[in-house]
Amino acid sequence: SSHMAPTHQLPPSDVRKIILELQPLSRGLLEDYQKKETGVPESNRTLLLCLTSDSQPPRLNSSAILPYFRAIRPLSDKNIIDKIIEQLDKLKFQHEPETEISVPADTFECKSFILTILQQFSACLESVFKSLNSGPQ
């Protein structure tokens, strides 16, 4: 819509709306994956740099997160992942480059990689939500 502000210009109130939409999607995806893949450990080789360090309060680093969700999409619940990608796209700064992420070829490592992404993303959303709720922006 022509009314809509460019996505990188959304105010904290709208960012908060998007985070509120993302939280149950992320939580549900993580819980379902944990039930389906019991006994898979978290990988210590994957670090999702999900927060920007250049803004106060921290901003969700959508451009860094999106490639991971695009990468795990074929291997997870596509419907939920698509909804997450749609929300993350709204938070993305225009013209920010996206790096390409490759998923580990080994099945067990791949499962561990996916679990780690989902866990770190959920924690990240919690962190951003808390910062948006803690007084003046």
Partner: antibody, heavy 118, light 111 residues
Framework: EVQLVESGPSLVKPGGSLRLTCSVT????????WKWIRKFPGNKLEYMGY???????DYNPSLKSRITISRDTSKNQYYLQLNSVTTEDTATYYC????????????WGQGTSVTVSS | DIVMTQSPASLSVSLGQRATISCRAS??????????MHWYQQKPGQSPKLLIY???NLESGIPARFGGSGSGTDFTLTIDPVQADDVATYYC?????????FGGGTKLEIK
């Protein structure tokens, strides 16, 4: 043309619950954000909260313990419930649409006047 | 919460003259050069009507007599020239931060 129409009781007893309906035509409540706002006697306005296209709700912290916003997508209606009302909740209650991020509430209902009195 | 202070509370203007309404936020409502401040008009017994969004953008169907300006914390709604149909109460509100907050309103009358 988008239209929002508020309905509900005009008189509520102190300590009781207030339940209002917003009936939406011309747009689906499964897109955008659907808000409740109230205007007190003397014209002071208060933002109450919303229900989103996906059913997520968010409330003004000043009302959080008493407010519930819900919806029925089959009727294209959303609802406001306010519990433990006092005379301070006497106001005109409006529903409004917030369709796009970074925009503004573009359509409002006409409002429904609610008096809390015994 | 961001406090919105609107002035004057009432305004009496002659037909054809300019009406100016101010709104001040207790903190900036800007992000990346955009101001999340909006103005609407309410006539007795009618739905509130959006006039200006994001400080200076005229809503579709609103006459060009209405204009908005300002950034940061200080904003102005201008009606020039005022017509008889403009008798109403005008409100500002911010959608920058939750909870959204409103100005106290300005009642415009014709002299």
């Amino acid at each position: 043309e988008v239209q929002l129409v508020e309905s509900g009781p005009s008189l509520v007893k102190p300590g009781g619950s207030l339940r209002l309906t917003c009936s939406v035509t011309g747009d689906s409540i499964t897109s955008g954000y659907w808000k409740w706002i109230r205007k007190f006697p003397g014209n002071k306005l208060e933002y109450m909260g919303y229900i989103s296209y996906s059913g997520i709700t968010d409330y003004n912290p000043s009302l959080k313990s008493r407010i519930t916003i819900s919806r029925d997508t089959s009727k294209n209606q959303y609802y406001l419930q306010l519990n433990s009302v006092t005379t301070e909740d006497t106001a005109t209650y409006y529903c409004a649409r917030y369709a796009n991020y970074g925009y503004a509430m573009d359509y409002w209902g006409q409002g429904t006047s609610v008096t809390v009195s015994s | 919460d961001i406090v919105m202070t609107q002035s004057p509370a009432s305004l009496s203007v002659s037909l054809g003259q300019r009406a100016t309404i101010s709104c001040r936020a207790s903190e900036s409502v800007d992000t990346y050069g955009r101001s999340f401040m909006h103005w609407y008009q309410q006539k007795p017994g009618q739905s509130p009507k959006l006039l200006i969004y994001r400080a200076s953008n005229l809503e579709s169907g609103i006459p060009a007599r209405f204009g908005g300006s300002g950034s940061g914390t200080d904003f102005t709604l201008t009606i020039d020239p005022v017509q008889a149909d403009d008798v109403a109460t005008y409100y500002c509100y911010q959608s920058y931060e939750d909870p959204w907050t409103f100005g106290g309103g300005t009642k415009l009358e014709i002299k």
